[in-house]
Structures are given as C-alpha cells and as structure tokens.
C-alpha cells in the first residue's frame, strides 16, 4: 500500500537540489528538537502544524483522483508529490513564492470547459455539494491540485529536509507568504485566469461582508478573470435564514463587486438563492413540481 511506498522512500527525500531562501526573520520563537549531542532548533509558529500523514495523504489523493478522472491518468503521482514537496521542503516557510509552486502547477495543468467554472467565497461546503450533483461544473477543489490540498496544512524548515508537524506559520500572526497561503493564491490565480464564458460565484449571504475584498475570491480571483475570455460573472447569493426574503443582490458589498467587475469590462449578474436546501434538491431532481417555482 501507500504506507509501504513511503517507508521505502524516506531515504529519497534527501535527493535533489533545493534552492534556499533567506535566513530566519519573523515572529516565530525557537524550540529545541532532536536528541543529538548538539541542540537543534525548530521554529515555533502560531498556526497548527503539518497535517499528519501529509505525504501519504497527498499521494493517496493523487492516485484516487487519477483513478476516477481517466483524462488525468497521464499524471505521474510520484512526480506530483516530488514537485509538491520541492515547493516547501528546506525553505524558510515565511518566504515561499508562487514561483516555488510552478513545477507543481505545470504537472497539474487542467482545463475547465467554458461556462463551467464555479468560484466560491466563505461557502465551500454548499459549493462542493452543488458540483457533486451538477457534475459538469467545477470548483477549484474538483481539480487535481485543489483536491490534493483541500483542508491540509503543511510547512517545512529552512535548511533541513524535514516536514514540521509541530507548527506552521499563521497568515495573520506570522506571515502571509507561507506554504499554504501561497499555494492557494497560486492555484486560485491560475483557476481564474483559465476560466471562460460565464463564470459563477457562490457567496455567503449570512456574512456581514457578502463580498469581501480580502477573501481569495475578492483579492485574487476577481482580478485574474480575463475580460477577453470571460463574458460575465454571475453571483449566487446564498441566504441563511428560512424567512429571509430580502434582495441581497442590493447589498452594498455586491454593488462594490459589480463595480469592480464592470470596470474590468465583464458583465455582472446576481441571483438570490433563498432556499439553498431546495436549490440543491432541484438541481438533483429538476422535474420535481416544487422546482418550477422560485428558489
């Protein structure tokens, strides 16, 4: 199984050339580690450490993905893992760049058909439930690279080949150029850049800022949609309350989104999804009589 493969590979992690980033600077404290005669030090970050079984999980997810997506069976999962670990292993985890992830991005190249891209902000679960039913639409996490990294945390250390399972940099408290944040910025940018036709975005109508300029959608994806390829952005504002009949498309933050998009010469549309449960049910069973009325 996969565990055996990794047992056999542990020695191989020391292979290959790794370019190094600048020396430590940042807010992390140092704690001793190792049991040698000389004390060795590990950076102590504010965020949770690398997810347990991280290498095994990435590799397993890659194999699973290629099993159920035959069009991606040309992908060599060992090369994918090598490129993934090469992006952060032995590098200072507050100095990761988008360039570090380019070998991985190249291996994971995938195209989404026009009109089939679904972006989301602060409402991941519903977006994924939707694409699970509407199989011809795709979120970033339905693509190989997003699927590999979804819900995982990872980081390494400068000048060692080890993965840090104790702590990783927190975006706010430590640094923004950490391995996880830079990964999502990189793949989100690429996902938006390659979108075409009418792009959809699911937004959480229960949040104080329905459109948040500081979210990945607001800070990365919106600005990387290509006006020459994208005719329109259609926002679906998802209502939280049962009795919430307000038109959230009139929310000031949605007007702000409309302004940003219009200035980029992309048309903007907005729809209220008053009943997300009914919405999903009607996607599953469009012929249901109750689905002829509004959702």
């Amino acid at each position: 199984g996969l565990n055996d493969i990794f047992e056999a590979q542990k020695i191989e992690w020391h292979e290959g050339s790794h370019h190094h980033h600048h020396h430590h600077h940042g807010s992390g404290s140092l704690v001793p580690r190792g049991s040698g005669s000389l004390p060795r030090w590990r950076q102590q970050w504010s965020g949770s450490g690398t997810t347990s079984r991280f290498p095994e999980t990435v590799l397993a997810r890659c194999v699973k993905y290629t099993e159920v997506h035959p069009e991606m069976r040309h992908v060599d999962c060992q090369s994918v893992w090598d490129a993934f670990k090469g992006a952060f292993i032995s590098k200072y985890p507050c100095n990761i760049t988008e360039e570090d992830y380019q070998p991985l991005v190249k291996l994971g190249t995938q195209t989404v058909p026009c009109n089939k891209t679904l972006l989301w902000s602060r409402i991941k679960d519903l977006a994924h439930q939707f694409t699970q039913v509407q199989r011809d639409m795709f979120t970033l996490e339905d693509m190989l690279l997003g699927y590999l990294a979804d819900d995982l945390t990872w980081c390494g250390e400068f000048n060692t080949f080890e993965i840090n399972y104790q702590s990783c940099p927190d975006w706010r408290k430590d640094c923004s150029n950490n391995p996880v944040s830079v990964f999502w910025k990189t793949v989100s940018r690429r996902f938006a850049e390659t979108a075409c036709g009418v792009v959809h975005v699911m937004l959480n109508g229960s949040r104080s800022k329905i459109f948040d300029k500081n979210s990945t959608f607001g800070s990365v994806e919106v600005h990387n949609l290509q006006p020459e390829k994208v005719q329109a952005l259609e926002a679906w504002v998802i209502h939280g309350g049962r009795e919430d009949s307000r038109d959230l498309c009139q929310d000031p933050t949605i007007k702000e989104l409309e302004s940003i998009i219009s200035k980029r010469n992309i048309r903007f549309f907005c729809k209220n999804i008053y009943r997300p449960d009914k919405f999903l049910q009607c996607v599953k069973n469009p012929e249901d009589s109750s689905c002829l009325s509004g959702i």
Partner: antibody
Framework: EVQLQQSGPEVGRPGSSVKISCKAS????????MHWVKQSPGQGLEWIGW????????DYAEKFKKKATLTADTSSSTAYIQLSSLTSEDTATYFC????????????????WGQGTLVTVSS | DIVMTQGALPNPVPSGESASITCQSS???????????LNWYLQRPGQSPQLLIY???TRAAGVSDRFSGSGSGTDFTLTISGVEAEDVGVYYC?????????FGSGTKLEIK
C-alpha cells in the same frame, strides 16, 4: 492483509429499501476509492458506482442513479450501499471492490473484493 | 458506454491443453499514457471475482504464470496454458478506460 467484509443476506419487500455494508480492514480506508458491483442471478457483472470515503463524493452509472445511494463511515472504515424502491430486478449479489496501487498508480483492476451480499426481493 | 463482447469456448477443454478466451471492445482502450485499460477476472463457482490481468498484459499479484494477456487497442486474448481443474469458472473482461467501467458477458470454462 486487505479484507472487505460484507454484511449478510437481506430479504426486502417490493417498494422497501435495504442497506448493506462493507467493512474494510488491512489498509487506510480513506486512501482508496470503494466501488460497488451488481451480479444478477446467473448473470454477468455491472458496475454501480464509486465513493471516495475521505470526501464522501460519489459517482454512479446512469442506470443506478435513482436506485443506489453510496455512503461511508470513516470512523468504522465501513462503506454502505442503500437500494431503494426495491423490485424483483434488484434481486442480485452486490460486491464492494477496490483497486491495488502499483508504485503510485491505480491498477485499474479490482484487486480486492468483498464476499458479496445476496439481496432477495420478495413479497 | 464502451461495449465489451466476449467469445465462447469450445467446451469442455481437455485438461492440460491451452485455452484462449477472446474479448472485443467497441472502442480502443489504449490511453494516452501508453497503458491499455483492459482487465481479466476469473469467477470460480460460488466465489467473488478474482483479478487475473490488468493493463491488458500485467499479471496481478499471486496469479499463476499460466495466465497471460495480449491484444491490441480493441481485440484482446486471455491465454491459459495447461488448463487445470482449479481454472474452472467464468472469465470476464472489463474495460477501465472510462466511466462507467463495463464488463463482458463472461466466458465459461469447463474441463474434460
């Protein structure tokens, strides 16, 4: 050693539902896709669908989309198939199955099978 | 869906002789990665299917070298050299190039 242990035979009334289980052992349950296959009496094999236990995502053959529901419980390493609105056509043996991984590539063949669960629909 | 068509065997096959089971697919099973996604299974009476061959010609773990797979993109053969009593059962070919994976109708092997 990889093992897929299925629940015992079921008898269901027409129109009712049955749920059968497949308990996995000898490997990490979330690392592999689980497939389900139907074999009608004296007939060949038909693929029903797959579930990714880690995410709960599924896919079904067109003919089973309204008939079968695949679920998984990661805490007990168990996959389930529920068959609804039973008719005599659903009388069959149902297998869970899994691929092997050959040096980080899915083999594309079902290397591990449960022993099968016979579902009989009878009034 | 890809349709898999299996040929019949001249039953029963004399013990110790070779048997060849054929299978045809309605489209090529050769992937751009160079692998041909054709599998062979044996289902012995009262048992679950057992994977014999994957990727058209690679023997599964623990399978006797008396079993070999060959073919092109659409025409495939499973050869059993020196048939033994334990080989009795129904042989299925299966394509796994695309979803849904589809099986042939099966070829029954009986021994004289």
């Amino acid at each position: 050693e990889v093992q897929l242990q299925q629940s015992g035979p079921e008898v269901g009334r027409p129109g009712s539902s049955v749920k059968i289980s497949c308990k996995a052992s000898g490997y990490i349950f979330t690392d592999y896709i689980m497939h389900w296959v139907k074999q009608s009496p004296g007939q060949g094999l038909e693929w029903i669908g797959w579930i990714d236990p880690e995410y709960g995502s599924t896919d079904y053959a067109e003919k089973f989309k309204k008939k079968a529901t695949l679920t998984a419980d990661t805490s007990s390493s168990t996959a389930y198939i529920q068959l609804s609105s039973l008719t005599s056509e659903d009388t069959a043996t149902y297998f869970c199955a899994r691929v092997a991984i050959i040096t980080t590539v899915a083999s594309g063949g079902f290397a591990y099978w449960g022993q099968g669960t016979l579902v009989t629909v009878s009034s | 869906d890809i349709v898999m068509t299996q040929g019949a065997l001249p039953n029963p096959v004399p013990s110790g002789e070779s048997a060849s089971i054929t299978c045809q697919s309605s489209e090529s099973l050769l992937h751009s990665n160079g692998k041909t996604y054709l599998n062979w299974y044996l289902q012995r009476p009262g048992q679950s299917p057992q994977l014999l061959i994957y990727w058209m010609s690679t023997r599964a773990a623990g399978v006797s070298d008396r079993f070999s797979g060959s073919g092109s993109g659409t025409d495939f053969t499973l050869t059993i050299s020196g048939v033994e009593a334990e080989d009795v059962g129904v042989y299925y070919c299966q394509q796994f190039l695309e979803y849904p994976p589809t099986f042939g109708s099966g070829t029954k092997l009986e021994i004289k």
